[in-house]
């Protein structure tokens, strides 16, 4: 089965500029994946941000602006990373990475 | 069927000011983010303002930052761009447009016919 | 911000031909946020293209796509009368959201 780790316990970043967050796949080829992000905001539910299936097919939560998060994956690494850009308060939140084995 | 139809272009004088509005039917609009991209005579596409579902997150490119607003009224299913300070390079066709189909991943698969914006003494 | 470069500015070919479009982004893109537009005077444009790769909706499959990092291309394997008209490429990945200026074909 396979296995998510976070490694970043953490990210502090100044307003306008650019937040990567890293989820390490093991146990599974990350290939044959989807794997999700989420957040969870302070006192509000957890949401849906981008997913990344196993063909490559990027999915977005709709209400959100293309260009505000970039999900990609690295085969080589076997890392899915989640990129927040132009960070603003807003983006205070928990981020999740969550996995679907094909 | 899903649609989008602006409307508010017009002539105006450099300084002025402008309303355009885009009105969605045919989907959900208050959960979809939309976007405004403009095209001036015979030139490319240029991407001008985002706003989210719940008008949280707004983005503007540098060229209208601080002249342009854009906002929404879910409850009319309308999406607006306060133009003030208008310049003659400003005078473009204006679309309204957005990504409804999740699969694409953001890419603008519905858009509005446009309304036509010159700014001209 | 990613600038869009796009070549030819005119390619001019003939009906039945095959058609190749370029597209080079100043710095890498993520074909998962890469598309291609195709537009016709007096209208909006209309997604071909998603995902560098991938034909949206309805869109025939003489139009592909192929391309990573820097470097995009569209293909038209063999021009119909309706496929002469402008085509635009865009990133989507990152705000500002960029279109290249545009490759039109024409009739030779």
């Known amino acids: 089965a396979g296995h998510l780790e976070q490694p970043q316990i953490s990210s502090t970043k100044t307003l306008s500029k650019t937040a990567r967050l890293e989820c390490v796949v093991s146990g599974i080829t990350i290939s044959a994946t989807s794997v999700y992000w989420y957040r969870e905001r302070p006192g509000e539910v957890i949401q849906f941000l981008v997913s990344i299936s196993y063909d490559g097919t990027v999915r977005k939560e709709s209400g959100i602006p293309s260009g505000k998060f970039e999900v990609d994956r690295i085969p080589e690494t076997s890392t899915s990373t989640l990129t927040i850009h132009n960070v603003e308060k807003q983006d205070i939140a928990t981020y999740y990475c969550a996995l679907w084995e094909v | 069927e899903v649609q989008l139809v602006e409307s508010g272009g017009g002539l105006v004088k450099p300084g002025g000011s402008l309303r355009l509005s885009c009105v969605a039917s045919g989907f959900t609009f208050s959960d979809y983010a939309m976007d405004w991209v403009r095209q001036a005579p015979g030139k490319g596409l240029d991407w001008i303002s985002s706003?989210?579902?719940?008008?949280?997150?707004?983005f503007y490119a540098d060229s209208v930052k601080g002249r342009f607003t854009i906002s929404r009224d879910n409850a009319k299913n309308s999406l607006y761009l306060q133009m003030n300070s208008l310049r003659v390079e400003d005078s473009a066709v204006y679309y309204c447009?957005?990504?409804?189909?999740?699969?694409?991943?953001?890419?603008?698969?519905?858009w509005g016919q446009g309304t036509m914006v010159t700014v001209s003494s | 911000d990613i600038q869009m470069t796009q070549s030819p500015g005119t390619l001019s070919s003939s009906p039945g031909e095959r058609a190749t479009l370029s597209c080079r982004a100043s710095q890498s893109v993520s074909s998962s946020y890469f598309a291609w537009y195709q537009q016709k005077p007096g209208r909006a444009p209309r997604l071909l293209i998603y995902g560098a790769s991938s034909r949206a909706t309805g869109i025939p499959d003489r139009f592909s796509g192929s391309g990573s990092g820097t470097d995009f291309t569209l293909t038209i394997s063999r021009l119909e009368p309706e496929d002469f008209a402008v085509y635009f490429c865009?990133?989507?990945?990152?705000?500002?959201?960029?279109f290249g200026g545009g490759t039109k074909v024409e009739i030779k």
């Open positions: 865009q990133q989507y990945g990152r705000s500002p959201l960029t």
């Open positions: 447009a957005n990504s409804y189909n999740w699969n694409y991943g953001g890419a603008f698969d519905i």
């Open positions: 706003i989210s579902s719940t008008s949280n997150y707004i």
